[in-house]
Amino acid sequence: DWVVAPISVPENGKGPFPQRLNQLKSNKDRDTKIFYSITGPGADSPPEGVFAVEKETGWLLLNKPLDREEIAKYELFGHAVSENGASVEDPMNISIIVTDQNDHKPKFTQDTFRGSVLEGVLPGTSVMQVTATDEDDAIYTYNGVVAYSIHSQEPKDPHDLMFTIHRSTGTISVISSGLDREKVPEYTLTIQATDMDGDGSTTTAVAVVEILDANDNAPMFDPQKYEAHVPENAVGHEVQRLTVTDLDAPNSPAWRATYLIMGGDDGDHFTITTHPESNQGILTTRKGLDFEAKNQHTLYVEVTNEAPFVLKLPTSTATIVVHVEDVNEAPVFVPPSKVVEVQEGIPTGEPVCVYTAEDPDKENQKISYRILRDPAGWLAMDPDSGQVTAVGTLDREDEQFVRNNIYEVMVLAMDNGSPPTTGTGTLLLTLIDVNDHGPVPEPRQITICNQSPVRQVLNITDKDLSPHTSPFQAQLTDDSDIYWTAEVNEEGDTVVLSLKKFLKQDTYDVHLSLSDHGNKEQLTVIRATVCDCHGHVETCPGPWKGG
C-alpha cells in the first residue's frame, strides 16, 4: 500500500550521505512508469535539501546529519506521478522522528548561586535551589535527565559535609549540625550537574552559602570592674563608659547592647544609655549625688541585646564603684522662704527676725549674711548672726513696695570656702496693720444748689484694715455746722452732706472731721460750690440775661 510507517533517524549520523532511509513504492508501478517526489519543510521548503528522493526508485535519502535539538520531527509528503505528470496516488504523509543522542552537557543557569541560612539551624533546613538545564531529551531517554551532587565544600569546618543536595530538584539543605557564623560566615560549594541521571556528562558551578547571624552570643563586659569619680550635685554628668564585646554581627540587633542597672542605685540617681556607634554603655547621673549623705555607690549593670537570645545564655554583669567627690556647696537658708509677721511702723532698730542658712558641707564653715534686695530700704541684717532689724518705717499701706500686706526681701548667705559659694533666701514680711490712717471722704469737691439742694453722698475710705475702719463717725467743725449737716449712713461707710440754710452763690470750705472705729480722726476740708439753682446741679449755670 501507498503508506509508510514513521521513520526514526538518530541525530548526528556519520553517513555516508546521502543515506538511504526507506523506499516509497506505489503498486501502480505495474501498470505504468512512476516518478516519485517529496515536498515539505526539509525537502523543497526550508530547511531545503535535508531529504531527497530517488525519482525512479522511490528511495528516501538523508543528505546531512540531523540535530534533534534544532528539529525533532519532520513532516513530509510523498508524491507518485505517471510519465505524463498525472498523479497516480494521493499525497502520502511521511513522519521522520529524530532520535536523541547525548550530545549536550548540562548547563547551570548561573555560574554562581547565592543562598543563605541562619546559623545553628537543624539538619533538614533548606538553604537554596540550584538549576541546570540539558538540551537533550529527558522524556524518552536519560540523556537530558540531570542529577545534582556536591563535589566539594570550602571550608571543611566543622565537618567536610555540612550540606547535601536533592539529586533531582537541586535543593541544597543542611545535613550536619554546627553552622556557626562566628567561625565560618560563608561556605563555597562546588556543585555538579550530571546528565544520564548521574551517569553521563558533568558540569560544575559554585553555590555560595552565607551563614546568617542569630543572637547566639551574649555581650560580655570587658573589663568587668570600673572605678569612677563624680563631683557631688552634678546632674547629667557622664560617670563611666562601659565596654562590651559581642561576637554577633556588628550593628545588628543581635550585637547592639541594652544595659540595665540591676542593683546599687537605691535612690534612682543613675541612668545608662547605649552609644549608637561604639555600643558602649554610658552611665550618667540622673540626680545630683550627695557626698555628705553617701560618698560611694556600688552599681551592678547587666547587659543584653536588643534582639532576644536564641538560646539560654549567661548574661554578663559589670561592677562600677562610684566615688562621690566633695564640692563646696552653697549655704542653704532654712527655710528657703521664710514668712515673718511684724507690725508696721515698728521703731527703728527694733528686731524683725533671725534668718540663717545651713552649709551642707561638713566642715565648720563661717557664713556671713547680707541683704540682697530690700526695695524700700527698711531693713538691715547682721552679717554674723543673720539678725534682721528695722532701719526705716515699715508701712503696710505703701502700695509701691507692699503687695497683699507682704513686703518681700531677698537675703544672701556666703561661706568662706575656696572659692566661696552663696545661697539666697526670701524673707516675706507680713505687715500687721496699725491704725495709722484716718478716714478720708471722696469726693472732696461738691457742687450744690442753694434752693431745694440735693444731699451730697461722700464715700469714706480708710487705708487701714478692719477693725481700724468702719463704722465711721462724722462731725462738722469750725462753724461749718451753721449751714451744713453731716450724717453717716446706717452701714457707716458713707457720709451725707446737706445744705441746711440759704447761701448765696459762691465757693465755701466745709470742715469735716471723720473718725474710724478705733477713733482715729482725720479733718478734711470739702470745697463746696453753691449755685443759684434748684435741685440737682453739676456746674453752676452762667448769669441770667433778660431780653
Epitope: 546559623e119 559535609l161 533531582s168 535543593t171 550536619s176 549540625s177
Partner: antibody, heavy 117, light 111 residues
Framework: EVQLLESGGGLVQPGGSLRLSCAAS????????MSWVRQAPGKGLEWVSA????????YYADSVKGRFTISRDNSKNTLYLQMNSLRAEDTAVYYC??????????WGQGTMVTVSS | QSALTQPASVSGSPGQSITISCTGT?????????VSWYQQHPGKAPKLILS???KRPSGVSNRFSGSKSGNTASLSISGLQAEDEADYYC???????????FGGGTKLTVL
C-alpha cells in the same frame, strides 16, 4: 568512650508529666544535634524530637507537638525531654541519639516510660 | 504506616546471604545518599551498621554491605551467622522538619 545515658523514665498517669535526661560524655556535645527516638513495645522506631547543637533550633514529630519540649544544657552536657499531657500511646522506650550528619550514632541504652492509670 | 517500607521478616540459614530492601520516594531514599541501617538485638539499643548507603563504621563486619537503586536501598548480609539474628531498621534523611524517616523494621531469623 562516646556514651549517652538516659534517665527519668517511669510510670505516670495519663495527663501527667515526666522529664527525661540524657547525659553525654566522650565527645564535644555542643557540636552535635541531638534527638529523641522512641520505640513502643513490639513496634518500630519513631523519631520524636531534635535540637540543634546550640539549642537555638528544634523540631518535633506531629504526634508530640505542643506537648513535649526538647532542651539542652551544653555546660552540663545534658539533653532533656519535658513530656506533658502524657497519653497511653506515649508508652515506649525513649532513646537519645546523636546526629552524625546523615545518621544517628551513638544511641543511649533507653529509658522506659509507661503511661497507665 | 512507616515512611519507608521494609519487609516484616526475612530468614536464612547460617552461611547464606540475605538482602533486606527499604523503599522510599524520590524525596528521601531517591534524593539523598543518606540511607543508614541499624541493628537492634532484643532489649538493646539500636546500633549503626551502615551510613551513607554503604559506609561501615569501624568495628562493623564487612559481611554487611549496602546499595541503592532509584528509590530503593538494600542491606545485604553475607555468610549469615547466628548473632546476626536481630531487627534491622533503615533510615533516610529528608529535607524539612521531619528530617529523618525510619522504616518499619525487618526481623531477621537465622534458621
Amino acid at each position: 568512650e562516646v556514651q549517652l545515658l538516659e534517665s527519668g523514665g517511669g510510670l505516670v498517669q495519663p495527663g501527667g508529666s515526666l522529664r527525661l535526661s540524657c547525659a553525654a560524655s566522650g565527645f564535644t556535645f555542643s557540636s552535635y544535634a541531638m534527638s529523641w527516638v522512641r520505640q513502643a513495645p513490639g513496634k518500630g522506631l519513631e523519631w520524636v524530637s531534635a535540637i540543634s547543637g546550640s539549642g537555638g533550633s528544634t523540631y518535633y514529630a506531629d504526634s508530640v507537638k505542643g506537648r513535649f519540649t526538647i532542651s539542652r544544657d551544653n555546660s552540663k552536657n545534658t539533653l532533656y525531654l519535658q513530656m506533658n499531657s502524657l497519653r497511653a500511646e506515649d508508652t515506649a522506650v525513649y532513646y537519645c541519639a546523636s546526629w552524625g550528619g546523615g545518621w544517628f550514632d551513638p544511641w543511649g541504652q533507653g529509658t522506659m516510660v509507661t503511661v497507665s492509670s | 504506616q512507616s515512611a519507608l517500607t521494609q519487609p516484616a521478616s526475612v530468614s536464612g540459614s547460617p552461611g547464606q546471604s540475605i538482602t533486606i530492601s527499604c523503599t522510599g520516594t524520590s524525596n528521601d531514599v531517591g534524593a539523598y545518599n543518606y540511607v543508614s541501617w541499624y541493628q537492634q538485638h532484643p532489649g538493646k539499643a539500636p546500633k549503626l551498621i551502615l551510613s551513607e548507603v554503604n559506609k561501615r563504621p569501624s568495628g562493623v563486619s564487612n559481611r554487611f554491605s549496602g546499595s541503592k537503586s532509584g528509590n530503593t536501598a538494600s542491606l545485604s548480609i553475607s555468610g549469615l551467622q547466628a548473632e546476626d539474628e536481630a531487627d534491622y531498621y533503615c533510615s533516610s534523611f529528608t529535607s524539612g522538619d521531619h528530617w529523618v524517616l525510619f522504616g518499619g523494621g525487618t526481623k531477621l531469623t537465622v534458621l
